[in-house]
Structures are given as structure tokens and as C-alpha cells.
Interface confidence: low
């Protein structure tokens, strides 16, 4: 019996087609993805093949103005329109709290939303009961397939799930649910979830009875053969893991942002054993037409976005200096504003010992592309912020050793004075440079804000200590020459859309007046 699994993950509100790098579509003839194009391909496959499942491995929420405005209603509407068969909860589904998940998505979705390792307690338990499930048995042709969900147990550090949801260890939580499916005579089981490729492989190895793992969170691109676009494969598609009980378990992920549709064909024998698996992600490029009915619906929903872009988010009573003459040479107040917003967006008081789990921010000055003049009545709009942060990136959480941070700050000024983008703006960090010293030895003082303290204060950076830092995904991926970050990071979790972080902060503060305050000094 043959099953076709179509899958997406980490779509991050890319409902409209995008450029090849998943930013805003500029030249339509070269654009990719989007739900209208996805629907065309899904329908084509559904017509051609008998047993098809369309699955999403989480993180539909967060990433563009679509989510900022519609807050998840757009996800439910268009996933319903595409007739998804199941979705796993990702960490970003909790970005607007549990309410922001329940109302727009859980209550509106016409497909099961799954997670076996999230347990509700207290008053929430009855409120959320049945709105998401640990597993779901889906009829497919003449057979049944069990789908069991999972979500990153790091979600409390990455999003806002509140105190009434407990995120258990994925493997511990999945095993009894898979066992339950076995007792129900379900012998074809897919683990669908959002914990990253390393955990996906562990689940394939450790959870007895899981036949296929469809994952997300790490934006992993797998491909067999010559890849069709710019993404570099982390391995072959499917990635085969040998389980502890000797089975070959295919593990798949489909990059992110709706650029690809994962396409996996699985052949099962009559006892539900995987005989063969093959496939590849399908690049959703302009050779695939956008479905006209979905496209018309997108255009209808778009109108509200255009209105939102020009509405006032808040006010500034000072000039927001985002000029390259400032931000690539010295501390600039636009850099301070953005870093303060990044830290504020990551406030998670999850432990009495810590005032927060993260206190530090770094931001490449070259990523700040425009100032904002206060003389326009002080008004700040989404449109203004899009000029400051035009690249559609995210502000991510990483864990780095102190020694890596030291290297990053040396790199920040290794060729100082040439208006290069690697000069770092900071938050929760005090750095002193001596430019008379040779490159690689210019950081003379590097103090960082403590987290395990009731009164935050600055202490010298310890080389061997592991620190959490918020930074742009561009830096996490080694951009602007920060190869040491990419090479030496100990953990990397994708965060929220950059503009959204800053706009939320400005809306919260209402009036802002960031200063240049001695975060970066030269001796």
C-alpha cells in the first residue's frame, strides 16, 4: 500500500508568493511559494495519486505583516482552504499567548492540530480540552494512518505559552501515545512535529512503532540529487535513520517559508512495515501557476494589510539615527532601540533564580538601513520600520561561549573605519575598543549584564561560560563574516520577525526616546 505525504513546515506567514530568498516578492515572474501556488501543486498531486496526506509540522504563525494584522485567523482560513489533513503545534503558535492560539486557530481549524508532549493544567485544562490532540487516526483510502504530534520542549523559552501548559520530553511523551495507537490496530504511524532535525532523528531512533518522522523548527533542507535553488542540503531526502529495533525510518523536513512542498512516497507492507521510501521537496517556482480562486481570496485579505502599513504604531520624540555614518562607526540610538526591543520581546520569567533567561543582544550595524525623523509629528508606522529593517529577517535566540562572543566583537572592528556592516550595535553589553591595537586584539573591555541576579549589573565576560544572546538570523547564519557564530553556536532557535519585534515594542511603549548611553566606547 502506497502513501504520499505532502508536507510543509515553518511557513511563517508567507501566504503570498515571495522572492527566492523568501522576502517580499519584487519580480513576480521570479517569485516562489505562497498558498495559491501551493494549492495548485497539492491539487495536481491529489488528482494524480490515490492516497495523499497534506501535513504541516508547525510554525505557521509569525513572520510577515499577515500575522501582525490577522493574528492567526489567516492561518486557519487558508489552511482550511488548502484542506490540510493535520498540523503539529510549533513554538511560534504560542507567540500571542494561549488565547492567541485557541481563538483564531484551534477553534477555527477544520483539521486536527496535534501535540502529545504538551499537557494542560489548572483552569486551562478544561478550556483547551479537545482543541488539540496528542494523536489522530486518519482514514486514507481503505487504510488508516495514525499521526502523533510533538512540539519543542524549549517553547517556554521561545514563546509565550503561559504557566498552565507543561512541555514534556518529546520521546517520553510520544511512546505511550504510539503504544495506544498500536492497541487500536493502527500499524502505520507518522510522528509529525516541531522540535528540530536532531530531535526528529532521535524520535526515529528511539520511539518504537514510529514509521515516518515529518519535522520542522530547524528549517532543514534535505534533497537527493542536484538541489533546484539556493538552499544547500543537510542530507538526503528522505534522511534514513536506523531505529534501535533495527527499522529504517525516513525522516523529512521541507526547509521553510512555503518555498518547497515536501513530497514523500512510502510503501507499506500488509503489516504496516515501511518497504520503501523516496521523494524530494518540490520547488514551488513560477513554472507552477497560482490557483486563481485562492489568489483572489489572498487579494481580498490583502486590502487590510495595506491600510495597516500606514497606521501609527507609536511616537518618537527623538531622532532615530539609523544612518550608516553612525551605526557602522559608533553606538547609535536606532541600534539601542532595536536591541532593547529584541530583549523586551524575549522576557520570559521562567525561573525564580533569573530575572530573565537572556540579557544580551547584538545587531550588525549594516542591518540598519534607514533613520526615522521625529519631525513628522513623531509618527512611526510599519512602513517606516520596513525601511529600517527591509530584509524580512528574524531575531533569533542562540547560545554561545564567551570566547565566541569575544571573537565576534574583535570581528566587529577588525577593519574599522571603512563603513562596513559588521560593526555591532548592542544591548545588555558594555564594550570598550582600542583601535590603536592590531586587529584581533582591539577589545579591551567586555562586560555583560547578569541574568542570574535580582538586580541586573554588568560583569566581565567569562570565556568558558555559555551565554544566551538575541541576534538577527543573518548573524546566526554567519553573515557579515561572523563565521565564528555559525561555526561555534551551541544552540539556535528561530525567533520573531524583526519588524514585528520592533513594532510591538513601540506600540507597547507608546512614546520612545532612545539615547546614546555609553554601551560602546573607544579608549
Amino acid at each position: 500500500w502506497e502513501l504520499t505525504i505532502l508536507h510543509t513546515n515553518d511557513v511563517h506567514s508567507r501566504l503570498e508568493q515571495t522572492s527566492e530568498d523568501s522576502s517580499k516578492c519584487v519580480n513576480a515572474s521570479r517569485c516562489m511559494g505562497g498558498v495559491a501556488r501551493l494549492f495548485t501543486k497539492v491539487q495536481q498531486i491529489r488528482r494524480a495519486e490515490p492516497n495523499v496526506l497534506l501535513l504541516d509540522a508547525g510554525d505557521q504563525y509569525q513572520g510577515t505583516i499577515w500575522f501582525t494584522v490577522y493574528k492567526g485567523a489567516e492561518v486557519a482560513h487558508f489552511m482550511n482552504a488548502l484542506r490540510y489533513d493535520a498540523m503539529a503545534l510549533g513554538n511560534h503558535e504560542f507567540d500571542n499567548g494561549v488565547e492567541g492560539l485557541i481563538e483564531p486557530l484551534l477553534k477555527e481549524a477544520k483539521f486536527p492540530i496535534l501535540s502529545a508532549n504538551i499537557k494542560a493544567k489548572g483552569p486551562l485544562a478544561s478550556q483547551i480540552s479537545g482543541l488539540y490532540l496528542p494523536y489522530k487516526v486518519l482514514p486514507v483510502g481503505d487504510e488508516v494512518v495514525g499521526i502523533v504530534g510533538y512540539t519543542s520542549k524549549e517553547t517556554p523559552f521561545l514563546s509565550n505559552p503561559g504557566t498552565n501548559l507543561v512541555f514534556e520530553d518529546e520521546i517520553t511523551a510520544l511512546q505511550p501515545e504510539v503504544d495506544k495507537l498500536k492497541t487500536l490496530n493502527v500499524n502505520k504511524i507518522i510522528a509529525l512535529g516541531h522540535s528540530g532535525f536532531e530531535m526528529d532523528k532521535l524520535i526515529a531512533q528511539k520511539v518504537r512503532g514510529v514509521d515516518v518522522v515529518v519535522g520542522g523548527h530547524s528549517n532543514t533542507f534535505l534533497y537527493t540529487g542536484n538541489p533546484p535553488s539556493k538552499e544547500v542540503p543537510a542530507g538526503k531526502y528522505p534522511f534514513i535513520v536506523t531505529s534501535d529495533d533495527g527499522r529504517k525510518v525516513p525522516v523529512v523536513q521541507a526547509y521553510a517559508f512555503g518555498k518547497y512542498l515536501g513530497y514523500l512516497k512510502i510503501e507499506f507492507d500488509e503489516r504496516g512495515n515501511v518497504i520503501s521510501s523516496h521523494g524530494n521537496p518540490i520547488l514551488l517556482n513560477s513554472s507552477i501557476p497560482e490557483d486563481p480562486s485562492i489568489k483572489a481570496d489572498i487579494n481580498k485579505w490583502r486590502i487590510k494589510l495595506d491600510n495597516y502599513s500606514t497606521q501609527e504604531l507609536g511616537k518618537t520624540i527623538v531622532y532615530l539615527d539609523g544612518s550608516s555614518q553612525s551605526c557602522r562607526f559608533r553606538e547609535c540610538n536606532m541600534g539601542n532601540l532595536i536591541c532593547d526591543a529584541m530583549i523586551n520581546n524575549n522576557l520570559r520569567h521562567t525561573d525564580e533564580m533569573f530575572w530573565n533567561h537572556v540579557s544580551m543582544c547584538i545587531l550588525n550595524g549594516g542591518g540598519i538601513r534607514s533613520p526615522i525623523d521625529e519631525r513628522n509629528n513623531g509618527t512611526i508606522t510599519w512602513e517606516n520600520l520596513a525601511a529600517v529593517l527591509p530584509f524580512g529577517g528574524t531575531f533569533d535566540l542562540v547560545q554561545l561561549k564567551g570566547s565566541t562572543l569575544k571573537k565576534a566583537f574583535e570581528h566587529s572592528v577588525h577593519r574599522y573605519g571603512q563603513s562596513t556592516g559588521e560593526f555591532l550595535q548592542v544591548g545588555g553589553i558594555h564594550v570598550v575598543y582600542d583601535l590603536s591595537r592590531k586587529p584581533g586584539d582591539r577589545v579591551v573591555k567586555l562586560d555583560v549584564l547578569c541574568t542570574k541576579c535580582r538586580v541586573p549589573s554588568y560583569d566581565p565576560l567569562k570565556m568558558d561560560e555559555v551565554y544566551k544572546v538575541i541576534l538577527p538570523n543573518f548573524l546566526a547564519n554567519g553573515g557579515d563574516g561572523f563565521q565564528m557564530i555559525k561555526d561555534e553556536l551551541l544552540r539556535h532557535d528561530s525567533g520573531d520577525q524583526d519588524i514585528n519585534v520592533v513594532s510591538t515594542y513601540i506600540s507597547k511603549m507608546k512614546v520612545i526616546y532612545p539615547a546614546v548611553e555609553g554601551r560602546i566606547k573607544f579608549s
Epitope: T224, N226, K230, V232, P233, G235, K236, F239, I240
Partner: antibody, heavy 117, light 107 residues
Framework: QVQLQQPGAELVRPGASVKLSCKAS????????MNWVKQRPEQGLEWIGK????????HYNQKFKDKAILTVDKSSSTAFMQLSSLTSEDSAVYYC??????????WGQGTTLTVSS | DIVMTQSPSSMYASLGERVTITCKAS??????LSWFQQKPGKSPKTLIY???ILVDGVPSGFSGSGSGQDYSLTISSLEYEDMGIYYC?????????FGGGTRLEIK
């Protein structure tokens, strides 16, 4: 750590065939394609072809289509290249190299093939 | 087949000097280009893939750039251990093809 072990040298007669081996260790053999590359003394590198150890799918350089046959033995995590109808033109160092990120990341030490009577 | 034209075929440079080697493809290869270093009697070592991505463990003094048909490898400050033969490879289309090599020697 990833290792690709190749025998140091092979001596064969003209007209004969030879089967060169490349034993992989330190990674999941079936997860990465294996390439073969030829290098003649004081000359550049030539790509012969590649094989997917998972399902034995192959891609050959047309120039070597009738010369080389690529195979694998999954049980021993070993890739093989059989070269037939050998002439002095086939005397060269032959490397196996694993593919990652679309290109070659780890190379074997190479086998020096000498075709001589 | 895509022809990769590498230049210069050989060069002498001084320690500490900035060195650039170029590779021109006969058609657009979409950044599917790698650079390798080979020392006498040794197998090649991969330095860069996708035109500009440095392989883990390769010194940061090496960098790659380019797009379309034209690519280059730069060594920011030549060191003694950088001498050897450098090859480019296109892996956009079968058959994969290498440049003719650049022999780099110390003055």
C-alpha cells in the same frame, strides 16, 4: 570522524580489469553520494561519476561510461569502481570523495593505478 | 560540457601578500562552485563550496566570491603552508568539471 580508506597502489596488465575500493567509516554510508575522480601525473582532476549508496543510483561522465562501473556494498560501507580494458592512459591516481552540500567534502587518500606489462 | 578556465596556471607570491585566483565558467553555474587545495602527494582538500562558503576548519584567510560565470578565491595574507595547487570545480551540471589548476609557490 569521517574516513575514506583506499588501498595505496594497484599494478595491472594492459587489457585487464581492476576493482578499486573505498571503505567509508565515521558516518552513515547510505546518507551521502560517493564520487570518483581521476588524476593523471602532473595533470588536473577529472570527475568520473558518482553513486548513491542508498539505492545505487549512478551518474557518469559520458567520457567514462564504457570504462568505469560504480557499485557499493552497504554491508561493509564500501564503494567500488571497476575499470575495464585498461591501457596506459588509465594509469592515474583515483580518488573517492564523499558529497555533502552538493560538492565534495571528504576525500580518500587515493589509489595509484599503474597499467604496465 | 561546461569548461572551467582557471588563471593564472602558476604564480609566485611573497609571504603576507594577498593572492587571488580566478575561475571562469563557459556558462552561468549558479554559484555551484567549489575550491580545493592539493599539496604534493596528497589528496585534495575542500576549502569553499557554493562559491563563498568556507568549509569548517579552513582558515578565515581564505575567501571565495563571484557569481554567474566569474569566481575567485582569495588568500588574504599568504602563509608558507598555503603553497600547493588550487582547483575550482563546477557542480551545477553533469559532468562536473574542474579548472586546470593554479600552482601557487612562494617567492
Amino acid at each position: 570522524q569521517v574516513q575514506l580508506q583506499q588501498p595505496g597502489a594497484e599494478l595491472v596488465r594492459p587489457g585487464a580489469s581492476v576493482k578499486l575500493s573505498c571503505k567509508a567509516s565515521g558516518y552513515t554510508f547510505t546518507s551521502y553520494w560517493m564520487n570518483w575522480v581521476k588524476q593523471r601525473p602532473e595533470q588536473g582532476l577529472e570527475w568520473i561519476g558518482k553513486i548513491d549508496p542508498y539505492d545505487s543510483e549512478t551518474h557518469y561522465n559520458q567520457k567514462f561510461k564504457d570504462k568505469a562501473i560504480l557499485t557499493v556494498d552497504k554491508s561493509s560501507s564500501t564503494a567500488f569502481m571497476q575499470l575495464s580494458s585498461l591501457t596506459s592512459e588509465d594509469s592515474a591516481v583515483y580518488y573517492c570523495a564523499r558529497i555533502r552540500y552538493g560538492t565534495f567534502d571528504y576525500w580518500g587518500q587515493g589509489t595509484t593505478l599503474t597499467v604496465s606489462s | 560540457d561546461i569548461v572551467m578556465t582557471q588563471s593564472p596556471s602558476s604564480m609566485y607570491a611573497s609571504l603576507g601578500e594577498r593572492v587571488t585566483i580566478t575561475c571562469k565558467a563557459s556558462q552561468d553555474i549558479n554559484n555551484y562552485l567549489s575550491w580545493f587545495q592539493q599539496k604534493p602527494g596528497k589528496s585534495p582538500k575542500t576549502l569553499i563550496y557554493r562559491a563563498n562558503i568556507l568549509v569548517d576548519g579552513v582558515p578565515s584567510g581564505f575567501s571565495g566570491s563571484g557569481s554567474g560565470q566569474d569566481y575567485s578565491l582569495t588568500i588574504s595574507s599568504l602563509e608558507y603552508e598555503d603553497m600547493g595547487i588550487y582547483y575550482c570545480l563546477q557542480y551545477d551540471e553533469f559532468p562536473y568539471t574542474f579548472g586546470g589548476g593554479t600552482r601557487l609557490e612562494i617567492k
